[in-house]
């Protein structure tokens, strides 16, 4: 049998005996556009495609809708993988999405989701959630049902304001809702009262700006 | 840096008043909505009044209608909840917090308790019977 060369996410990359946290190069099925993503390989039986991580600020996450969509920053520290990539593989199959918090005093938490998925580009990348569980609040940080994606230059929140510009970067934005995990980094002692940080209000509260996050998903049937 | 001081609480009798005032720095009352929240022990925070200067717009709870006043002091950057004829269950810590007064949702008037990002540290209230 030919080893299979290109694998669409990074639970096929571990099935193929690639246990190893890192970079790996994606390909969606008939498709020749690469991406590359860092593939977690340990946490919860590994085989995590990372789609998002903030850990230290050296990525400025205020884009435009078409970097959010192709995706920007290093696979190897703060990064976003790309909405297009994310949505044509999570209309392929079903996945999990779980966002991994850390905060400024040493805890850490997580939301799962049980259903994941986001709308083509033509509708906005709506995302779409289901089934939540997990030590980062009993309610969902990200409002349901799930709303269009936002950028400073696509306005398709549900707010009188224009909440990417109001909050920066790009997200799921309601009026602006609980939860922003790509708005400004703040440092230590510097992480309170803040209207524009990254915010996930189900589990840290209001104004609360978040030392490190991940969002990473994997097929339900892995 | 965003800063909200709450001042003026205290012990009082059934019936008294008091006057709570928050004074904010960092940033002017102009382009934000001030809301006062209180929790009282073992109970869920809740919104008792709100007032958005941009529009002269305020908001009470029915619990404090006709008992409560907020009003704001733009040269003093200060927003004041005057409390009337109170009672032992207005018993509580004393909040308030900020919000940009721009961040509603399309048909609605005043803001979700998740919006507002920067909150004071309380004064207690306490109402004796």
């Known amino acids: 049998k030919e080893e299979q060369i290109s694998f669409r996410d990074c639970a096929e990359v571990f099935k193929s005996g690639h246990t190893t946290n890192g970079v790996y190069t994606l390909t969606l099925p008939n498709s020749t556009e690469e991406v590359k993503a860092y593939c977690d390989m340990e946490a919860g039986g590994g085989g995590w495609t990372i789609i998002q991580r903030r850990e230290d600020g050296s990525v400025d996450f205020q884009r435009t809708w078409k970097e959010y969509k192709v995706g920007f920053g290093n696979p190897s520290g703060e990064y976003w993988l790309g909405n297009e990539f994310v949505s044509q593989l999570t209309n392929q199959q079903r996945y999990v999405l779980k966002i991994h918090l850390k905060d400024w005093e040493g805890n850490e938490a997580y939301s799962l989701y049980e259903h994941f998925y986001l709308s083509s580009e033509e509708l906005n990348y709506r995302i779409h959630l289901k089934g939540l569980t997990g030590t980062a609040g009993k309610i969902s940080s990200i409002s349901q049902p799930g709303n269009d994606f936002s950028t400073k230059d696509a306005d398709n929140d549900k707010c009188i304001c224009k909440c990417s510009q109001m909050l920066t970067g790009g997200w799921w934005f309601d009026a602006c809702g609980p939860s922003n995990l790509n708005g400004m980094y703040y440092p230590q002692r510097q992480n309170t009262n803040k209207f524009n940080g990254i915010k996930w209000y189900y589990w840290k509260g209001s104004g609360y700006s978040l030392k490190g996050t991940t969002m990473m998903i994997r097929p339900a049937d892995f | 840096e965003v800063q909200l001081v709450e001042s003026g609480g205290g012990l009082v009798q059934a019936g008294g008043s008091l006057r709570l005032s928050c004074a904010a720095s960092g940033f002017t009352l102009d382009d934000y909505a001030i809301g006062w929240f209180r929790q009282a022990p073992g109970k869920e925070r809740e919104g008792v009044s709100c007032i958005r200067d941009s529009d002269g717009s305020t908001y009470y709870a029915d619990s404090v209608k006709g008992r409560f006043t907020i009003s704001s002091d733009n040269d003093k950057n200060t927003v004041y909840l005057q409390m009337n004829s109170l009672k032992p269950e207005d018993t509580a810590v004393y909040y308030c917090?900020?919000?940009?007064?721009?961040?509603?949702?399309?048909?609605?008037?005043?803001?979700?308790?998740?919006?507002?990002?920067?909150w004071g540290q309380g004064t207690q209230v306490t109402v004796s019977s």
């Open positions: 917090a900020a919000v940009p007064a721009g961040r509603l949702r399309f048909g609605e008037q005043w803001y979700p308790l998740y919006e507002y990002d920067a």
